[in-house]
């Protein structure tokens, strides 16, 4: 069966929005008026994961690409990227672990916990114009909460 | 409160269409999608479609495809679900119900029910 | 589409009874299954949803358990107004689909 996805933009908590860089990152910066049009729609797809209480699994494609957040490690560091798939194959229902997010929402607040990596989150900076990327800290300088706004499929 | 209110009785003829509504208050409407399902006399129940308001997104059960068109008013946060080409057997209660946009937590609210009768 | 095979259809208990339903899926679901309860001439009532969390405001009383394709709902303790028809749905597939339901009587 076919997996259940929606269409999404996400801002940071400070409203900055993703954007790509290059071809294979995401930056957050914040966008006004028509350079609005330039964030990124999200695919997000409901995937099958380990059960958890308050965790959703899900998997983060970039709309009509093939491009998936993933978790991999590098140089022994949990690190997050775009990687291409196969569209045939893709989505799908057991996605692997590295595409899965454990979406944590709390007053319509969302984290995004690496499934492959427990307590590692989708971050931004506090500063413009950097890369989206895989932090390990909570509740610190980086920003780990996001909102989601729906776009029409 | 968080509740849905949905529209009074109807008495249809056969070939006819009714449009049901389900209002929402007390919580985002955006964020839920509403499931229409149907409960004909003494019969089990029937999921009909879905939509979810925030996106604009609805699914339906191939079985009422062309039949039933289900639509939403964010601005009142009210819900319809119309179904044409009535006969006798879709006589039944419509029940609205609300589920989180992840699906997570199932059909966790419902309308009261608004009787359908179609007879000639 | 996925059947769900309810079980039984009907059940005779006093109150204080440990009560379990059981509901088959024909296919795996995941953790898509809900329990709700409907008295006659009312709206159904959601119970658990994702198998076994408990709705708020349901009591204790109520739990859900199983997976990919075998569910349960248990009522430990039968309490006078527990006498209703049980549902189970599957919602992890359209079209969504219930099971037949099971009537829970007084003995």
């Known amino acids: 069966a076919p997996v259940r996805s929606l269409n999404c933009t996400l801002r940071d908590s400070q409203q900055k929005s993703l954007v790509m860089s290059g071809p294979y990152e995401l930056k957050a910066l914040h966008l006004q008026g028509q350079d609005m049009e330039q964030q990124v729609v999200f695919s997000m797809s409901f995937v099958q994961g380990e059960e958890s209480n308050d965790k959703i699994p899900v998997a983060l494609g970039l709309k009509e690409k093939n491009l998936y957040l993933s978790c991999v490690l590098k140089d022994d560091k949990p690190t997050l990227q775009l990687e291409s798939v196969d569209p045939k194959n893709y989505p799908k229902k057991k996605m692997e672990k590295r595409f899965v997010f454990n979406k944590i929402e709390i007053n319509n607040k969302l984290e995004f916990e690496s499934a492959q990596f427990p307590n590692w989150y989708i971050s931004t900076s506090q500063a413009e114009n950097m890369p989206v990327f895989l932090g390990g800290t909570k509740g610190g300088q980086d920003i780990t909460d996001f909102t989601m706004q729906f776009v029409s499929s | 409160q968080v509740q849905l209110v949905q529209s009074g009785a109807e008495v249809k003829k056969p070939g006819s269409s009714v449009k049901v509504s389900c209002k929402a208050s007390g919580y985002t409407f955006d964020r839920y999608w509403i499931e229409w399902v149907r409960q004909a006399p003494g019969q089990g129940l029937e999921w009909m479609g879905e939509?979810?308001?925030?996106?604009?997104?609805?699914n339906y059960n191939e079985k009422f495809k062309g039949r039933v068109t289900i639509t939403a008013d964010k601005s009142t946060s009210t819900a319809y679900m119309e179904l044409s080409s009535l006969r006798s057997e879709d006589t039944a209660v419509y029940y609205c119900?609300?589920?989180?946009?992840?699906?997570?937590?199932?059909?966790?609210?419902w309308g009261q029910g608004t009787l359908v009768t179609v007879s000639s | 589409d996925i059947q769900m095979t309810q079980s039984p259809s009907s059940l005779s208990a006093s109150v204080g009874d440990r009560v379990t339903i059981t509901c088959k899926a024909s296919?795996?679901?995941?953790?898509?299954l809900s329990w709700f309860q409907q008295k006659p001439g009312k709206a159904p009532k959601s119970l658990i949803y994702r198998v076994k969390r408990l709705v708020d405001g349901v009591p204790s009383r109520f739990s859900g358990s199983g997976s990919g394709t075998d569910f349960t709902l248990t009522i430990s303790s039968l309490q006078p107004e527990d006498f209703a028809t049980y549902y189970c749905?599957?919602?992890?597939?359209?079209?969504?689909?219930f099971g037949g339901g099971t009537k829970v009587e007084i003995k």
């Open positions: 749905v599957q919602y992890d597939e359209f079209p969504y689909t």
């Open positions: 296919q795996d679901i995941d953790r898509f």
């Open positions: 939509i979810l308001p925030g996106s604009g997104d609805i």
């Open positions: 119900a609300r589920m989180y946009y992840d699906y997570d937590q199932g059909f966790s609210l």
